[in-house]
Structures are given as C-alpha cells and as structure tokens.
C-alpha cells in the first residue's frame, strides 16, 4: 500500500479504488465489480458478442479490441464520411462499393462483372465457365470433350476459344444445302477421283475410299522401286518396255538398234504419249524388217527365234500401250507395209470387225476385257509383211489326228520340205491377255496369193515354244472355207499369231513371204 491509500497489487487492466480495493478499467470485467484480492483478473469485454448492446448498423462489422471495440464497414462497403471506424449505428455511413466500376478488368477475359451488395460476380460469356479454383476466372468450355457431342457423326468437333465448329472430316464435304462449321453441319464422302481433287500421278488410277482415295498402278505398270502401291503418292513405271529386250544368244547389230529405239521410247514414257509411242515402235519395226541387215545372215532357227520374240513382245507392248489410248478407231500404215488397226472402247456388247489390206478380223467385244479390269477394252490387229523373211522354212507341227488325215489325202505333203506361207501373218491382240480359250471364236478372212490346184490350205498360228522359238500349229484353228485368193479361218484362241499357210507337195522356189501381226 502506498501512502496515498491506493492498493499497489491491483491486477492488470484495473485501477485502485482505495488502499484495499481495485476496479477493472472500462472495457474489462472481473468476477466481482470490486477486486479485493490480487488473485482476481480483469478480462476484456467482447462488446461485439451477440448479447452485447453495441449495434454498428447495416453493412458493417464489429471488431473487438483490447478494452474497446470498433465498427468498420463490411468488405465491399465503404464509409461515405471517410472515417474508417465508428462506435455506433448513428455514426454508420457504410454503402456498397461498385467494384466493377472501380476495376473494369476484375473479371479478366471472357467474363462480365456484375456488382452485388458488398461484392460482385463474374458472368462468363457464352462458351466459357468459371474456373472452380478461381471463381473470378472464366475459362473456355471444350464442347467437344464435355460429353455434349454437339456435332453430327459425319463431322468432327473442333474446339476453339469460346465456341466450337463441326467441320467435315478430311475427304468429306457438306451435303448439298448444309453449311460447314455450325452444329447443323452434315457431311458426305468426297469422291476425289471423279471430282478431280486427287493428286494421283498419271502412271496410276485413282480409287475412291471412304473419306479418302488411293492411287493404284495402271494395268501393265508396277510401283517404282521402293514406292508402295495403293498410296496417295504411288508412282509407277511401265512394264511394257522393260521386258522387251533382245533375245539371249542372238548377235545382231540391226536387232540391237531396234531394241535401243524401243528402250529410248520407254525411258521417258507417259500415258499421254501412247499414240506416238505405238507409231514409233511400228515405224522402227517396219524399218527393221524392210532392211533386216545382219539378221538375214543368222541361222534359220535363230531367225525363227527372233521372229517369235518380236511377235510375242510386240503383242505385249501394244496391249500395254493401247490401254492408255482414248476411245475410238485407229489405223496406221508404214512404208514397208506394216499396218495396225486398233479399236478402243468402254465395254460394249457387240461384235467388232477390224479390216486391213490383206485381212479382216471379227470377234465379240466381251472377249476383250478381263472382268474387274478398270481400263478400256482394246482389240487390235497388226500386219507385218516383212516378218515373212524371218519365218521362211519355219516348221509346222500338226496334231496327230490331222497328220493322219493329211497323210491319207495328201501323200506328198509330208515328204517335200517346209510348208510355204501363202498369206500375211496376222497377229490379233486384246486388252485381256487371257485368250487361250475364247468363249466365242474369232474369225479371220485372209487375202493371199493364188493357191496351186490340189494343194492343202491350212489355218495355222505361231506357237511360241519353250525354247523361245516356235513353230506353226493348227490346234484350235479350223479352215472354214477357201477360194483361189482368200481363206476364212476360225480360231478359239489368240494365244499368239493366227496365220494362214499353204502346204505344197510341189517343190518350188520360196516367194517373198509376208506376215501380218
């Protein structure tokens, strides 16, 4: 106790009343109003507690302080008076703050700020939603993955910021009247082949697939080394020329020069060059046979081998090249008498007749095309008068029954040397190379030199033997009728070159022999 009569032991936050008593300071309370022992304490009164008489008024919050309290405007409100704190409702000047006006970028991108009492909300633009972890940030709604599946199945959904598009898939296009983009887009497959939107090389044929296309080698063409077939970037090369090379074991400069020309023509060959290439090959062949040069010095068997090789190769080459021609009838003739007649058509149901100087061929169009072959149908006939020089003394191999019959009727036939070629040899070819057994026969009418009376006239064809050479044969060919200078033959195949031959039993010098291919 001090001399002035004031207790010195008063607890914290209290003041002495006299020498023996203390009282809590304003804003504090103790168990009893007067404190008489130092064990008692003064505790802060929470004026903001629910039962308190303090009222700060609306839009405000009461903040308890040590020994007192403050009234402050609630978040989102501010005092008009400017005073940050006040003590009661009568001093309250709190009013709503318009955060949207204060900070226009409050909702960042893609949202609109909406003021509310004491706060604000962000309203997202169409195609956006509030981010759960940041409710003030609008993010793009991915309509394509949100499970709404807003697009037609013929389209694919393309999400973009704030929106989406229903676009036609690659290789598809909007159906007539449909847009391309909105959610009502409906698409259909584009036929790139017929619409010309493909990038197929000219060495290939375009095939449409669902949503795409592929490029396949033309008939008679093969993919270039290392490039697969049936791709968009497939490039093919013509097989026509690569296999037509000089026969092995034959040494002839004249023949080598001919094949050099063939290879030169094949080197930069393109489908559009088919017409010129056919003409150039036949021109070269015409010249070769007009002036065979050292071919004439070869042994007879080798000459037959060369003839066989030329006839066989020419058929393949012309078949391959003619598939690239446009529809119509072509006739070419050359100085030494070589002649080509060719008809190209889309499949038609009729017979076709090709007429030449020394021969006429008639057959059914439906023989020409192999089923499933997309190319045009081709029927061709070639005459090569010069081939007779190479086929002189070529053997005839008869079927046993024909041999027996001839032995009985033409005694001298089999005793007196090789048969003689009466006519040009004609070679017929089709786009279809499977001509071993035609469903309906082909008819040839040959014009030829006069037949010596009592001699047998045979319709024959050149059969390419396994040895690469060949011989005349009659299998599958029959003689329908013969007059002095013409003969009609009917054959059930075009396996190689149908020919007309006369068998003489009178020995005489061979005339200049002519051949049609």
């Amino acid at each position: 106790q001090d001399s002035r009569g004031c207790a010195r032991w008063c607890p914290q936050d209290s003041s002495c009343v006299n020498a023996t008593a203390c009282r809590c300071n304003p804003g504090f309370s103790s168990f009893s109003e007067i404190i008489t022992t130092p064990m008692e304490t003064c505790d802060d009164i929470n004026e903001c507690a629910t039962l308190s008489k303090v009222s700060c008024g609306k839009f405000s919050d009461c903040w308890n302080t040590e020994g007192s309290y403050d009234c402050v405007c609630s978040p989102g409100y501010e005092p008009v008076s400017g005073a940050k704190t006040f003590k009661n409702e009568s001093e309250n000047t709190c009013q709503d703050v318009d955060e949207c006006q204060q900070n226009p970028r409050l909702c960042k991108s893609y949202g609109t700020c909406v003021n509310t009492l004491g706060s604000y909300t962000c309203q997202c633009l169409p195609g956006f939603k509030l981010k759960p972890e940041d409710p003030k940030l609008c993010t793009d709604v991915n309509e394509c993955t949100s499970g709404q599946n807003p697009c037609h199945s013929s389209t694919h959904c393309l999400n973009n910021v704030g929106s989406y598009q229903c676009r036609c898939r690659p290789g598809w296009q909007p159906i007539p009247g449909s847009p391309n983009g909105p959610n009502n887009t409906v698409c259909e497959d584009v036929d790139e082949c017929s619409s010309g939107q493909h990038q197929c090389d000219s060495s290939t044929v375009c095939f449409n697939t669902v949503g795409s296309y592929s490029c396949r080698c033309r008939p008679g063409w093969k993919p270039r080394h290392g490039i697969p077939n049936n791709q968009k970037d497939t490039v093919c090369e013509d097989m026509t020329f690569s296999t037509w090379t000089p026969p092995p074991g034959v040494h002839s400069q004249t023949l080598s020069r001919f094949f050099d020309k063939v290879q030169d023509l094949g080197r930069d060959y393109k489908p559009g060059l088919a017409n010129n290439t056919i003409q150039s090959i036949l021109q070269a062949l015409d010249e070769l046979l007009e002036a065979p040069g050292d071919l004439e010095t070869l042994p007879r068997l080798q000459q037959h081998c060369v003839a066989s090789h030329l006839l066989d190769g020419l058929e393949d080459v012309l078949r391959g090249l003619s598939k690239n021609l446009s529809n119509g009838l072509l006739n070419f003739s050359y100085p030494a008498g070589t002649e080509l007649s060719l008809e190209v058509q889309k499949q038609v149901d009729r017979s076709v007749t090709l007429r030449q100087n020394q021969a006429v061929m008639q057959l059914d169009w439906n023989q020409a095309q192999k089923s499933g072959d997309p190319g045009p149908s081709v029927v061709g006939l070639v005459s090569i008068p010069g081939m007779g020089k190479l086929l002189a003394e070529a053997p005839l191999v008869l079927e046993p029954e024909k041999q027996m019959l001839l032995h009985e009727t033409h005694q001298g036939l089999l005793q007196d040397g090789s048969p003689i070629l009466l006519s040009d040899v004609i070679s017929a070819f089709l786009s279809n190379n499977d001509t071993q057994n035609l469903s309906s026969p082909v008819t040839f009418t040959f014009s030829h030199r006069s037949v010596i009376p009592r001699q047998k006239v045979l319709c024959v064809f050149w059969e390419h033997g396994q040895n690469g050479c060949g011989h005349w044969a009659t299998t599958g060919c029959s003689t329908i009728g013969t007059r002095d200078t013409s003969t009609i033959c009917r054959c059930t195949h075009l396996s190689s070159f149908a020919v007309l031959m006369a068998h003489y039993d009178v020995q005489e010098e061979d005339p200049v022999l002519t051949v049609i291919t």
Epitope: D201, D260, D268, G272, N276
Partner: antibody, heavy 118, light 106 residues
Framework: QVQLQQSGAEVKKPGASVKVSCKAS????????MQWVRQAPGQGLEWMGA????????RHTQKFKGRVTMTRDTSTSTVYMELSSLRSEDTAVYYC???????????WGQGTLVTVSS | EIVLTQSPATMSASPGERVTMSCSAS?????MHWYQQKSGQSPKRWIY???KLASGVPARFSGSGSGTDYTFTISSMEPEDFATYYC?????????FGGGTKLEIK
C-alpha cells in the same frame, strides 16, 4: 495449227530470278514433253530440261539442278521455266519446244531474250 | 552424257554444190535429229529419226547413219540453205546438241 507463244524479253540483275512462260495451242497439251533450250549470243543450242504437262514430271541437266524450276498449268496449256540466282552468263535466248523421242523437237517458240546485267 | 561433235564447225559452199557434214557421238545413239537455224530465228526441225525429212523440207536434204556416226547431206545447194545445222540425240538424258556446222556462201 501447233503454236508455242513465249513471254516477252526480260532484263534482270545478277542474283535475281526470271520466269519465262510458253503457251501451247493447236494440239493435245499432254501428248508431248515440253523442252527448254537456251542459246547464248553467238553460241550453240543448250538443252536445259523438260516438263511433262500430264503430271508435272521434270527432267533437267545437272548444270541447272537447283536453279531451274519447270512447271505447267494445264488449265491454260502453259509451261513455265524459272531460273534463279541469275549470272551474266545466263544472258541468252530461251526457247520452249514440243518434243518426242522419235520425232525430235518439231515445234519451237519464238524465243525469249533474257539479259542479265548489273 | 553423250557428247556430239559436229564437223566441220564452218564450211563454205556454192549453190549447186553437194555438201556433207557429220555428227559423231561419244556413245551409240538410236534417235538422231537435225535442226536448221538462220540468224535471228528459232531453230527448225529439219531431219528426224536419222533420215526422215520434216514437213516442208526439200528432197535434196538427206540423213543417214547409225550407232555413233551420222551424216547430213545436201545434194545440191540452194541459196536458202545457208544456215547453221545442229544435230541432237535423244537416246539418253541429258539430251545433247552438237556444236553446230555453219554453212556459208563461198
């Protein structure tokens, strides 16, 4: 009748590019390769390359590889030859000519004089 | 590449004279063509495929040869024949021209 009409004369600076056109008429554009041949003043003929209008396939000499571009526009039956990184020695008359292996170059354009000078 | 050498490079002749020029190839050639060019004009195809005369070419012109040696002949010179003649091969890429033979009036 077959005609090949070339674009007019050009004067270019070294390092620049020139594009010469050749418009074909009177025949089926895709039935022949189109050749490009040049002739420097007082010199002989020099083959540069060729383009096949049917598919845009090209051939050219090693000498011009990387510098010459040959293209075609089938809708207008026109072929183009672009020569880049021009040098003074590229000054020449440039010809287009229709060509086929067995027939040679049977029709020629009137020629386009390209002068390269600084 | 196949190099074509033409000889002579220049030759003089009088009208009525027979003229022969040659083209020698460094390798065998199967398609040889010849062109005529007059000063200030585009070349013209003159003979193709060794011996075939282009349309409008007079019969006094002829071509022959095979392999590596080819010949171009004018049986009787006419005043309009004075020009430069080029041979050209089409047997391998790159296509090549000979250096030309200039035919001058004597």
């Amino acid at each position: 009748q077959v005609q090949l009409q070339q674009s007019g004369a050009e004067v270019k600076k070294p390092g620049a590019s020139v594009k010469v056109s050749c418009k074909a008429s009177g025949y089926t554009f895709t039935n022949y390769w189109m050749q490009w041949v040049r002739q420097a003043p007082g010199q002989g003929l020099e083959w540069m390359g060729a383009v096949y209008p049917g598919d845009g396939d090209t051939r050219h000499t090693q000498k011009f590889k990387g510098r010459v571009t040959m293209t075609r526009d089938t809708s207008t039956s026109t072929v183009y030859m672009e020569l880049s990184s021009l040098r003074s020695e590229d000054t020449a008359v440039y010809y287009c000519a229709r060509g086929f292996t067995a027939y040679g170059m049977d029709y020629w354009g009137q020629g386009t004089l390209v002068t390269v000078s600084s | 590449e196949i190099v074509l050498t033409q000889s002579p490079a220049t030759m003089s002749a009088s009208p009525g004279e027979r003229v022969t020029m040659s083209c020698s190839a460094s390798s065998s050639v199967s398609y040889m063509h010849w062109y005529q060019q007059k000063s200030g004009q585009s070349p013209k195809r003159w003979i193709y495929d060794t011996s075939k005369l282009a349309s409008g070419v007079p019969a006094r012109f002829s071509g022959s040869g095979s392999g590596t040696d080819y010949t171009f002949t004018i049986s009787s010179m006419e005043p309009e024949d004075f020009a430069t003649y080029y041979c050209q091969q089409w047997s391998s890429n790159p296509l090549t021209f000979g250096g030309g033979t200039k035919l001058e009036i004597k």
